[in-house]
C-alpha cells in the first residue's frame, strides 16, 4: 500500500493557500504543491519558492529551504570578495584576497568563509603586515618574515658602521605606512654637521649637532624675501646640497579697491605692505562684482602687485531697463561690465535706426542706452493714387504726400493730399475717388438733423449719422452711407404722444402716479391713467394702460 | 525677400523626440529677434510654441516648457526645434516663422504614431 | 497666460457685407494684438498689428479696432477671397496667445 504524506512543517517557509490545502492532507504520493521560503532562504534550486512532491519516502525536497548568505553583509576593509555571485546557499563557500600590504590572521594572502545555519561562518578580515625589509649595512636580530601592525623588529650594525650617534643597535616599528624607517647602518665619515646658515633665511627646525646621510632639512625666508631654488638641502657623502637664496621682494601696499573693500579693512590695515603670495578676502559695492561673477572673492598679492587688478567690475541689471513696446531678453538678470544684451521690437514699433532688434552694453556707468522701440507705420497701400516719396518706413508724427492717378480726386476737386503717421497708424488711406462715386449733402429727415455739419460732397463709403427731436423715436439705421453716388435709406423719426390736461378733463382722468400737467411719450410707451375722484371707469381695464403708436393714444373715459 | 523652410521627419514614434530645423535664407538670422515656432493640431486652431533670439536666448510656451528646445545656428543660418516625450496629441502642422515681419514657412505636418 | 476669447466662432455672410469679429483679452493688453487670416490648407498671413495697423499689402477694406480688452476685427464689405478663419493674437507678454478661431463661409 502507499504510504501516504502527512502536512508539511516547512521549517523557513510554507505552503501557499497553507489554510485552504491543510483539508486535502494525508497527500497521496505523486501529489506536488507550491511552497515559498522565507527572506534568506531559498529552493534546492535557488529560487524563492517551488514545487514539494510527496513520494514513495516523503516529501522531496527532504530539506525544502536552505539557508542562504548575503555578499552584501560581509563586511572586508583592505580586502576583496571574489565576484561570482551575490547570494550563497547553506555551505556554500566564499573566497576573498587581501589587498597588498594586509594578510589574513594566518598570514595568508587570501582565505574563505562559508554560509551556515546562522550566517557566514566568520567576517574575513585583512590585518596590516610588513614584510622583512631591506638591511643596510645591518641585520635582523630575529628570523620571522611577516610582521603584524606595531609589531618590533631589532636590528644591529655590522663592524664599522652606526645607526645613529654612535649607537649600533636600533629597532623600527611595523606602521600603518609600513616600517617606521629602513634599518640603515651608515659609516661616521658620511655624516653631516649642522646646515649652512643663509640670509635672510633659517631652517625650519633646530639645528643638531651630527645629521645622517641623506637627512634633509628644510629652510624658510623672513617677510618680504622670496625663496629662491629648493627649500630643503640633503646630506651626502659628508656634505650638504646649495642652500636656497632669501632675494628681497616687492611687498604690496593696502589695496584702495574701486567700488569695493577688503573685509575686516580696519584691523587689517597695520599689516601692510604684505608679502607676495599673501591672499585677502574681499566684497563689493552694490551694482557691482568680482570677476567671477560673485559679490566676495580673494585678492592676492604677487609679483606684479594685486590681482585681480579691477577687483570689482560694474554690473548693469536688466530691472534698470525700461522698454515700452518691446521685450529683453530672458538670459539672465545681471550683466557684467561690456556684456551685451538683446531687444526686439514689437510690430508696428522699430529701433532709432529703423530695425526690429537691437543692443544694448553694460558700460562704467550703468547701460550704453536704454532700448527704445519707435511708433512707425508701413508704406500704405494706394488706392487710386501713388506717394510723392520713396522711403518705406515712417516714424510717429512723419508725413507722406501723395497724388491721384487723372480722372481721380479727394474732394473739392483736389488731386493732391497728406497722411500722418500716429499711433494708430496712418491718419487715414490715401485714396482717391472718381468724381461721379460721390454723394452730395444727404437728404434731411422730418423732426430730426445729422450729428454733423454737412459738407458739400462727401467721398464713397462715407457715413453720415442721424438724431431725432426729444422725444422722437428713430426708426431704421442711424447711419447713411455713400455708395455710387447715391445715399442710403435714411431713418425716420416717428412722433412721440402728447398727453394734455384738457385731454385728461374731458375723459374725467388723470396720470396714475403722476401730477404732470403735459407728458410726452415714445412710440411703444405705455401711459398708466386712473379716474379722478368721484368719477367711475366707464371703458374696460386695458384702457387704463394706454400705449402710444406713432402720436396717437386712445384715452380711456370715466363718468 | 526673406523665406524660411522647415525640415525634419513627418513620423515621430510615441515617447520619441520631434526634431525641425527651419533654414532661413534671402536674410541673416542676425538681423532679427522673432524667430518663432507655431503648431496648429489637424481641423484645430494655432498654438504659440516658443521663440528665440539670435544670442541664443529663449521664450517658450509654459505648457510645452518641460519638453521644448529652440535653438539657433548662426553659423547655418538656421533655427531648430526639440519636442520631447511626444504623444498623438502632439500630431500637428509645424510653423515656422520671424513673427515681426510676418515671414512664414510652409509648414510641415508631423504625425505621432507607432 | 493671457487668454483670448472670439465671438462668434462662426458666421455665414454674403459677399458685399460687413462683417465684424470681436476678440476679448483676460486681462489689458494695451494694443498688442495682430489679426490673422488662414484660407484651408493655407499657411496663416497678417492683416492687422498694433490692433489697427494695415499690414503692408493687405486691402484696406480690413481695418481694426480696440484697446485694453475689446478688439475688433472689420471687413467693411466682404469680397469673395475674404472667406477663410480669422484669429487674434496677443503679444503683450509671454507666453504669446491666440484666440479660438472665427470661421466665415457663404451664406
Known amino acids: 500500500e502507499v504510504k501516504p504524506c502527512d502536512f508539511p512543517e516547512i521549517q523557513h517557509g510554507g505552503l501557499y493557500y497553507k489554510s485552504l490545502r491543510r483539508l486535502y492532507f494525508p497527500a497521496a504520493a505523486g501529489q506536488s504543491y507550491s511552497y515559498y521560503c522565507d527572506q534568506n532562504f531559498v529552493t534546492p534550486s535557488g529560487s524563492y519558492w517551488d514545487y514539494i512532491h510527496c513520494t514513495q519516502d516523503g516529501w522531496s525536497p527532504t530539506v525544502p529551504c536552505l539557508r542562504t548568505c548575503s555578499k552584501s553583509d560581509v563586511e572586508i576593509e583592505n580586502g576583496f570578495i571574489s565576484e561570482s555571485s551575490s547570494i550563497y546557499i547553506l555551505n556554500e563557500e566564499t573566497q576573498y584576497n587581501c589587498k597588498p600590504g594586509y594578510a589574513t590572521a594566518e598570514g595568508n594572502s587570501s582565505g574563505s568563509i562559508t554560509c551556515l545555519q546562522n550566517g557566514w561562518s566568520t567576517q574575513p578580515i585583512c590585518i596590516k603586515f610588513c614584510d622583512m625589509p631591506v638591511f643596510e649595512n645591518s641585520r635582523a636580530k630575529s628570523n620571522g618574515m611577516w610582521f603584524k601592525l606595531h609589531d618590533t623588529l631589532d636590528y644591529e650594525c655590522y663592524d664599522g658602521y652606526e645607526s645613529s650617534y654612535g649607537n649600533t643597535t636600533d629597532s623600527i616599528v611595523c606602521g600603518e605606512d609600513g616600517w617606521s624607517h629602513l634599518p640603515t647602518c651608515y659609516n661616521s665619515s658620511e655624516n653631516c654637521g649642522p646646515p649652512p646658515p643663509i640670509s635672510n633665511g633659517d631652517t625650519t627646525s633646530f639645528p643638531q649637532k651630527v645629521y645622517l646621510p641623506w637627512s634633509r632639512v628644510e629652510y624658510q625666508c623672513q617677510s618680504y624675501y622670496e625663496l629662491q631654488g629648493s627649500k630643503y638641502v640633503t646630506c651626502s657623502n659628508g656634505d650638504w646640497s646649495e642652500p636656497p637664496r632669501c632675494i628681497s621682494m616687492k611687498p604690496c601696499e593696502f589695496p584702495e579697491i574701486q567700488h569695493g573693500h577688503l573685509y575686516y579693512e580696519n584691523t587689517r590695515r597695520p599689516y601692510f605692505p604684505v608679502a607676495t603670495g599673501q591672499s585677502y578676502s574681499y566684497y563689493c559695492d552694490q551694482n557691482f562684482v568680482t570677476p567671477s561673477g560673485s559679490y566676495w572673492d580673494y585678492i592676492h598679492c604677487t609679483q606684479d602687485g594685486w590681482l585681480p587688478t579691477v577687483p570689482c567690475l560694474r554690473t548693469c541689471s536688466k530691472s534698470d531697463i525700461e522698454i515700452e513696446n518691446g521685450f529683453i531678453s530672458e538670459s539672465s538678470s545681471i550683466y557684467i561690465l561690456n556684456k551685451e544684451i538683446q531687444y526686439k521690437c514689437k510690430p508696428g514699433y522699430a529701433t532709432a535706426d529703423g530695425n526690429s532688434s537691437g543692443s544694448i552694453t553694460c558700460l562704467q556707468n550703468g547701460w550704453s542706452a536704454q532700448p527704445i522701440c519707435i511708433k512707425f507705420c508701413d508704406m500704405p497701400v494706394f488706392e487710386n493714387s501713388r506717394a510723392k516719396s520713396n522711403g518705406m518706413r515712417f516714424k510717429l508724427h512723419d508725413t507722406l504726400d501723395y497724388e491721384c492717378y487723372d480722372g481721380y480726386e479727394i474732394s473739392y476737386g483736389n488731386t493732391t493730399g497728406s497722411i500722418v503717421c500716429g499711433e494708430d497708424g496712418w491718419s487715414h488711406f490715401p485714396t482717391c475717388y472718381n468724381s461721379s462715386e460721390k454723394c452730395g449733402p444727404p437728404p434731411p429727415i422730418s423732426n430730426g438733423d445729422t450729428t454733423s455739419f454737412l459738407l458739400k460732397v462727401y467721398v464713397p463709403q462715407s457715413r453720415v449719422e442721424y438724431q431725432c427731436q426729444s422725444y422722437y423715436e428713430l426708426q431704421g439705421s442711424n447711419y447713411v452711407t455713400c455708395s455710387n453716388g447715391e445715399w442710403s435709406e435714411p431713418p425716420r423719426c416717428i412722433h412721440p404722444c402728447i398727453i394734455t390736461e384738457e385731454n385728461m378733463n374731458k375723459n374725467n382722468i388723470q396720470l396714475k402716479g403722476k401730477s404732470d400737467i403735459k407728458y410726452y411719450a415714445k412710440t411703444g410707451d405705455t401711459i398708466e391713467f386712473m379716474c379722478k375722484l368721484g368719477y367711475n371707469a366707464n371703458t374696460s381695464v386695458l384702457s387704463f394702460q394706454a400705449v402710444c403708436r406713432e402720436g396717437i393714444v386712445e384715452y380711456p373715459r370715466c363718468e | 525677400q526673406v523665406q524660411l523652410q522647415e525640415s525634419g521627419p513627418g513620423l515621430v514614434k510615441p515617447s520619441g523626440t520631434l526634431s525641425l530645423t527651419c533654414a532661413v535664407s534671402g536674410g541673416s538670422i542676425s538681423s532679427s529677434n522673432w524667430w518663432t515656432w507655431v503648431r496648429q493640431p489637424p481641423g484645430k486652431g494655432l498654438e504659440w510654441i516658443g521663440e528665440t533670439y539670435h544670442d541664443g536666448s529663449t521664450n517658450y510656451n509654459p505648457s510645452l516648457k518641460s519638453r521644448v528646445t529652440i535653438s539657433v545656428d548662426k553659423s547655418k543660418n538656421q533655427f531648430s526645434l526639440k519636442l520631447s516625450s511626444v504623444t498623438a496629441a502632439d500630431t500637428a502642422v509645424y510653423y515656422c516663422?520671424?513673427?515681426?515681419?510676418?515671414?512664414w514657412g510652409q509648414g510641415t505636418l508631423v504625425t505621432v504614431s507607432s | 497666460d493671457i487668454q483670448m476669447t472670439q465671438s462668434p466662432s462662426s458666421l455665414s455672410a454674403s459677399v458685399g457685407d460687413r462683417v465684424t469679429i470681436t476678440c476679448r483679452a483676460s486681462?489689458?493688453?494695451?494694443?498688442?494684438l495682430g489679426w490673422y487670416q488662414q484660407k484651408p490648407g493655407k499657411v496663416p498671413k497678417r492683416l492687422i498689428y498694433a490692433a489697427s495697423s494695415l499690414q503692408s499689402g493687405v486691402p484696406s477694406r480690413f481695418s481694426g479696432s480696440g484697446s485694453g480688452t475689446e478688439f475688433t476685427l472689420t471687413i467693411s464689405s466682404l469680397q469673395p477671397e475674404d472667406f477663410a478663419s480669422y484669429y487674434c493674437l496677443q503679444y503683450n507678454n509671454y507666453p504669446f496667445t491666440l484666440g479660438p478661431g472665427t470661421k466665415v463661409d457663404i451664406k
Open positions: 516663422l520671424e513673427f515681426y515681419f510676418d515671414y
Open positions: 486681462q489689458d493688453i494695451r494694443n498688442d
